[in-house]
């Protein structure tokens, strides 16, 4: 606890103080005050630099004194024998005394008291930046008229911070200008304009004077301008060293004066204004600005549009243009749009064709569809080259958007039929040979592929069962064989209206329009062994003659089986009418003259005992088109016959090519079209 | 040619089991149904089992159900007959036979078109 | 199961003769029907399939008729290589079943 004064005393005193003894006396008085330490007794063991006994007085780290021998005052009115004025208020005093005295000594008797100092003088750091007042234990600082007192109680400084300057004009200068500006202040103006325009500050070179900077190059006083994240200076010396127009980019603008306790000139003058703030005239490429200016301000609004072939993406939606708007800020709004070329995607894809990846999908790239050949062609031509337009859709010269349709090819065998192996009235055949040819079970019966959907066939082959069984691309018709191919399953059977249906088809004597069509649930996919025969077409080109030769194939009785296991072939050549009427019925189910020949049927066989039998009945009669030699046509259909091994009947298709086509056009599906 | 060779016949006691095999060549085997039929010292045939072609569907006759597995192995042309709880009236010349199925949904059968010449089995005690 | 009863169950008969064997189903099988021939210690061989379908390389004097049930095996004139045992198969339904078998034998 502080005291105001005190009395020190070594041991024992005034009897003789003991031997190796080390004892100290910490002294304090208040804050404010110094110590003044005085001796008036002093009887210590004298030896070279007190290094035996001592008395040692210490301020902080500093050794103040330290005493030994005897001391008597030299002055008679007073008893000091030695004195210390420390200007601190606290102090510490050391007494030690070694293992032997030679003598009796008696030690010190010693008093301090606190003493006032004067804060104002005896320091070498003045406290005060302007006027010091000493009094008895303290001082206070004091400034002269117009400034006042920082918080730090020891600086004065003018009061010229605090302005918000808000009009678009404005003049702003250094306290007291032209006169000197006030030493050690801080002042701080602030201009805050509306949003969307920024502060462009005017100086004069001659309007400006403040203190020059050190030979290190800072600034004693300086004038800064802070305007965001950017700051301008600082600046200092005779003549304003910066730009003389000052476009800060922004609608607040702080600036600091800030001055030293030395040095002062007349100041600054500055003069601000507010510009709406400009956005740049950016560089945004495949568009044009709309309308078209050298500068643009803050509130102006152009349309970007995108050149032909380029959009502008934001999110899922394309747009052909864009408004962008001079925000506050001095950017564009909607700026991260950007006018890329038009992407078409990646192309649809197309049945029975391909699509190579193309290396872009962009405006100008260019694609090319092409059909699985040799089993498909492109129907709709065009050739199948796409580019990709500027309106984002990959389009054709011919058919613009349309995609290009893949149809089956007809007519094609892989592999030609030749009768290799001589067999009792036909050949062994591969399903390559005869890729149309389908297989009924139940009846045991066959029919001809004419298209991805649809079957042609005899009437009497599906009169009995509307819901057939039908596969494809199998030679053999073991049940392990077709349970590998295609089975195909019908959707609807279309008899032929001019088919008589009987409540005992056994008796059948009148086979008139023995034609059907079955339409089928799913596409059929073509390849090797699968594959439709064409139609006949409509000209006289495909009216058939007598000894005009055909193929025939199925599964239908042989001489050895009721039923061939492997597809069988034979050539045969078309004959007249009357050779069919004279064959003698097998097993008449009635009168000879009861069975009805008509222009509708055609005849054919009667050759080498090749012929069509039971089990064959809805196969195609396949002849060579007159117009291409490398397709095969339907020209008659497997119907009946009057004995197996002469001559059969088979439906003449060509009477029938309206019928078909109507009855595939009417019940197509969308994906078809 | 077209060849069925059965093999795995012998003596044994009632109530042992027996393996039969029957090796084919000549024809593409997994393209047939395969049948056994049992002949009995001086007595007339008896069809015991059949499998179609892909071994998905079996066939049993009633003296042999529960008893007899008939089963094949088309990687190896092979088909075959375990045999287990014999019984002495299950005596006899076992032959393989061939048969064959056409169409896909409804079937048509030619059975025992082609025959091996036979194992013997003899159940005694 | 179907029944097949087959007669008659032996026959005599001279080398010429038109011989002929009948085989009665228990229940209508249509005409999923065959015909063996059997030598003694010989395997079965196939002579006629679906009731009237003669086997390949079997002699024509060889035929079959009928449906549903009633069946006939016909030698039209037997030959001295004809004398054997015949059976009669049904395969209309699971568990296939033969005829007893005629035993045809020289007079």
């Known amino acids: 606890e502080p005291t105001m004064y005190g009395e020190i005393l070594s041991p024992n005193y005034p009897q003789a103080y003991p031997s190796e003894v080390e004892k100290s006396w910490d002294i304090e008085v208040p804050e404010g005050y110094g110590i003044h330490l005085y001796f008036t007794h002093l009887d210590i063991e004298l030896s070279e630099n007190c290094a035996y006994d001592s008395v040692q007085i210490i301020s902080g780290d500093t050794e103040e004194g330290r005493l030994c021998g005897q001391r008597s005052s030299n002055n008679p009115h007073s008893p000091i024998v030695e004195e210390f004025q420390v200007p601190y208020n606290k102090l510490q005093v050391i007494f030690k005394s070694d293992f032997s005295n030679e003598e009796r000594f008696t030690g010190f008797a010693a008093y301090y008291v606190a003493t006032d100092i004067n804060e104002c003088t005896d320091f070498v750091d003045v406290p005060c930046s302007h006027f010091c007042n000493n009094f008895i234990g303290g001082y206070f600082c004091s400034c002269p008229p117009e400034y006042f007192l920082h918080d730090d109680m020891k600086n004065c400084g003018v009061n010229c911070s605090g302005d918000v300057f808000t009009a678009l004009i404005g003049e702003i200068a250094s306290p007291n200008y032209p006169k000197p500006y006030p030493e050690n202040s801080r002042c701080e103006y602030q201009i805050r304009l509306e949003k969307g325009f920024q502060v462009v500050v005017t100086l004069r070179r001659e309007d400006f004077d403040v203190e020059a900077a050190d030979s290190a190059g800072n600034c004693l006083d300086s004038l800064v301008f802070v305007a965001g994240d950017r700051q301008f200076g600082p600046y200092c010396g005779h003549g304003f060293p910066g730009p003389l127009n000052i476009e800060t980019k922004s609608n607040a603008l702080d600036i600091i004066f800030q001055t030293d306790l030395t040095g002062q000139k007349k100041g600054w003058k500055l003069r601000y204004h507010g510009d709406p703030m400009p956005c740049p005239k950016e560089d945004t490429p495949n568009s044009v600005w709309e309308p078209a200016k050298a500068k643009y301000v803050f509130r102006d609004v152009v349309q970007i549009t995108c050149l032909d072939g380029f959009e502008v993406v934001e999110g899922r939606v394309g747009a052909t243009s864009f408004y962008s708007t001079c925000q506050s800020n001095g950017k564009w709004s909607n700026s991260k749009l950007k006018c890329q070329p038009v992407d078409c995607g990646i192309p649809e894809s197309i049945e029975n064709g391909k699509v190579e990846d193309p290396e872009s999908t962009l405006f100008g790239s260019v694609i090319r569809y092409t059909c699985e050949e040799p089993y498909y062609y492109m129907e709709n031509g065009g050739g199948g080259e796409y580019h990709c337009a500027g309106n984002g859709s990959w389009v054709n010269e011919v058919l613009g958007p349309e995609l290009p349709k893949c149809v089956p090819v007809c007519g094609v065998p892989r592999e030609p039929f030749e009768e290799k192996q001589r067999i009792i009235g036909g050949s062994d055949a591969d399903i390559k040979n005869f890729p149309w040819q389908v297989f009924f079970d139940n009846p045991w019966a066959g029919g001809a592929l004419i298209n991805e959907y649809w079957v042609l066939t005899a009437a009497h082959v599906v009169e009995g069962n509307r819901e057939p069984t039908m596969y494809v691309g199998s030679t053999s018709v073991q049940t392990s064989r077709l349970a590998k191919s295609k089975m195909l399953t019908p959707e609807h059977v279309f008899i032929h209206p001019g088919w008589k249906l009987l409540e005992v088809p056994e008796g059948r004597t009148n086979f008139d329009n023995d034609i059907a069509l079955v339409r089928l649930k799913d596409p059929v996919k073509m390849g090797p062994t699968v594959s439709p025969i064409c139609l006949p077409g409509t000209s006289s080109d495909y009216n058939l003659m007598d000894g005009d030769l055909g193929l025939i194939s199925g599964w239908g009785r042989t001489e050895k089986r009721d039923r061939a296991v492997r597809l069988k072939a034979a050539r045969l050549p078309v004959a007249p009418l009357r050779k069919c009427k004279e064959v003698k019925v097998e097993k008449p189910t009635a009168d000879a003259e009861a069975y009805v020949f008509t222009p509708n049927m055609i005849c054919a066989g009667g050759e080498k005992g090749m012929d069509s039998c039971k089990g064959d009945s809805g196969g195609a009669f396949a002849v060579q088109d007159p117009n291409d030699k490398t397709k095969f046509y339907a020209a008659g259909l497997v119907s009946w016959g009057p004995q197996c091994g002469t001559y059969g009947l088979y439906t003449r298709v060509k009477n029938y090519v309206d019928w078909i086509m109507k009855t595939m056009q009417e019940n197509s599906t969308p994906r078809e079209d | 040619e077209v060849q069925l060779v059965e093999s795995g016949g012998g003596v044994v006691r009632p109530g042992g089991s027996l393996r039969l095999s029957c090796a084919a060549s000549?024809?593409?085997?997994?393209?047939?149904?395969m049948s056994w039929v049992r002949q009995a010292p001086g007595k007339g045939l008896e069809w015991v089992s059949g499998?179609?072609?892909?071994?998905?569907?079996?066939g049993y006759a009633d003296s042999v159900k529960g008893r007899f597995t008939i089963s094949r192995d088309n990687a190896k042309n092979s088909l075959y007959l375990q045999m287990n709880s014999l019984r002495a009236e299950d005596t006899a010349l076992y032959y393989c036979?061939?048969?064959?199925?056409?169409?896909?949904?409804?079937?048509?059968?030619?059975?025992?078109?082609?025959w091996g010449k036979g194992t013997t089995v003899t159940v005694s005690s | 199961d179907i029944q097949m009863t087959q007669s008659p169950s032996s026959l005599s008969a001279s080398v010429g003769d038109r011989v002929t064997i009948t085989c009665r189903a228990s229940?209508?099988?249509?005409?999923?029907l065959g015909w063996y021939q059997q030598k003694p210690g010989k395997a079965p061989k196939r002579l006629i399939y679906?009731?009237?379908n003669l086997q390949s390389g079997v002699p024509s004097r060889f035929s079959g008729s009928g449906s549903g049930t009633e069946f006939t095996l016909t030698i039209s004139s037997l030959q001295p290589e004809d004398f054997a045992t015949y059976y009669c198969?049904?395969?209309?339904?699971?568990?296939?079943?033969f005829g007893g078998g005629t035993k045809v034998e020289i007079k």
């Open positions: 499998i179609n072609w892909e071994g998905g569907s079996t």
């Open positions: 229940q209508g099988i249509r005409n999923d």
């Open positions: 679906t009731a009237s």
């Open positions: 036979a061939r048969d064959e199925q056409l169409g896909g949904q409804t079937y048509y059968y030619y059975y025992m078109d082609v």
């Open positions: 000549g024809f593409t085997f997994d393209d047939y149904g």
């Open positions: 198969l049904q395969y209309n339904q699971v568990p296939l079943t």
